[in-house]
């Protein structure tokens, strides 16, 4: 069955925007004015996932690119990556678990927990111009809260 999707940008709670850093990495930094056009536009889709009260399973693709955020083990550590997919087959309702994030939405703040690695979250560093990564701590130095902005076509 078809599912809903939307186009959005994400900023961390310090208002850092997400931009491409090379072909398969995102970084977070403060942008202003025309530089805001560098922001990555996500295509966020509702997908099938495990049931939990305030968690909504989503996939995060890059709009009009065949790239999705995914979570895999690298050197025995849960790692966030941009993964290339066959555009003929994606997005789909039953996404592989590595592509699924549990969106937790409280007071207009969003967290994205990896479905593959519970309690690991899409995170940014306090520092400028650092990679977006999968972090295993909440409420520490690293930032796990984001705001979402709809993108007009």
């Amino acid at each position: 069955a078809p599912v809903r999707s939307l186009n959005c940008t994400l900023r961390d709670s310090q208002q850092k925007s997400l931009v491409m850093s090379g072909p398969y990495e995102l970084k977070a930094l403060h942008l202003q004015g025309q530089d805001m056009e560098q922001q990555v536009v996500f295509s966020m889709s509702f997908v099938q996932g495990e049931e939990s009260n305030d968690k909504i399973p989503v996939a995060l693709g890059l709009k009009e690119k065949n790239l999705y955020l995914s979570c895999v083990l690298k050197d025995d550590k849960p790692t966030l990556q941009l993964e290339s997919v066959d555009p003929k087959n994606y997005p789909k309702k039953k996404m592989e678990k590595r592509f699924v994030f549990n969106k937790i939405e409280i007071n207009n703040k969003l967290e994205f927990e990896s479905a593959q690695f519970p309690n690991w979250y899409i995170s940014t560093s306090q520092a400028e111009n650092m990679p977006v990564f999968l972090g295993g701590t909440k409420g520490g130095q690293d930032i796990t809260d984001f705001t979402m902005q709809f993108v007009s076509s």
Partner: antibody
């Protein structure tokens, strides 16, 4: 106070058009998913459609082609454009905010505006 | 498209009674089921989401259960304020959203 107020309802002849407005106060509509739900007199609730960003709108099958949802973030307002109206479109039309993106449920509702299609 | 079917259509009960309303989905919707209360001339009010989670400010006498295609709304001890019409609705991010036809709860 956080609230939604619908306006634009009234009497319209069959085949006519009407545009309903839903204006938010106490919060910004710009990043809220907004739906329209209608209720014919003495009948049950019927989902019309929902808008996320302006390119991402979804409709009940019966509403596709005749009804269009749009938004003007600068006015903190969402619209429902209704064309080729029929007697069976007579209803109270509510706008509602999705509780969380893709939750598919609605925690904040307006008071409704009545549309009567009659010659 | 999903069809939601509620039963009964009308239900008469007395203050203090335990009442149960059922809702059936035409296909599995996992736990994506919400319940609303509506009083005459008023907008619906969200009671329960994700089949069993109480919405903010809703009294604990309301509870929901079920998954897949079969769901129930239970009011453990009916209060005068509870006489209203109740609707179930499939939720989540599927393209189609549908409400049940409603259950009118009246005083016996």
């Amino acid at each position: 106070e956080v609230q939604l107020v619908e306006s634009g309802g009234g009497n319209v002849q069959p085949g006519g058009s009407l545009r309903l407005s839903c204006t938010a106060s106490g919060f910004s509509l710009s990043n809220s998913a907004m739906a329209w739900v209608r209720q014919a007199p003495g009948k049950g609730l019927e989902w019309v459609g929902i808008i996320y960003d302006s390119a991402s709108t979804y409709y009940a099958s019966w509403a596709k082609g005749r009804f269009t949802i749009s938004r003007d973030n600068s006015k903190n307002t969402v619209y429902l454009q209704m064309n080729s109206l029929r007697a069976e479109d007579t209803a109270t039309y509510y706008c509602a905010r999705e509780r969380a993106i893709f939750s598919g449920d609605f925690a904040l509702w307006g008071q409704g505006t009545l549309v009567t299609v009659s010659s | 498209e999903i069809v939601m079917t509620q039963s009964p259509s009308t239900l008469s009960a007395s203050v203090g009674d335990r009442v149960t309303i059922t809702c059936q989905a035409s296909q599995s919707i996992s736990s994506w089921l919400s319940w609303y209360q509506q009083k005459p001339g008023k907008a619906p009010k969200l009671l329960i989401y994700k089949a069993s989670t109480l919405a903010s400010g809703v009294p604990s006498r309301f509870s929901g259960s079920g998954s897949g295609t079969e769901f129930t709304l239970t009011i453990s001890s009916l209060q005068p304020d509870d006489f209203a019409t109740y609707y179930c609705q499939n939720a989540g991010g599927g393209v189609s959203i549908a409400f049940g036809q409603g259950t009118k709860l009246t005083v016996l």
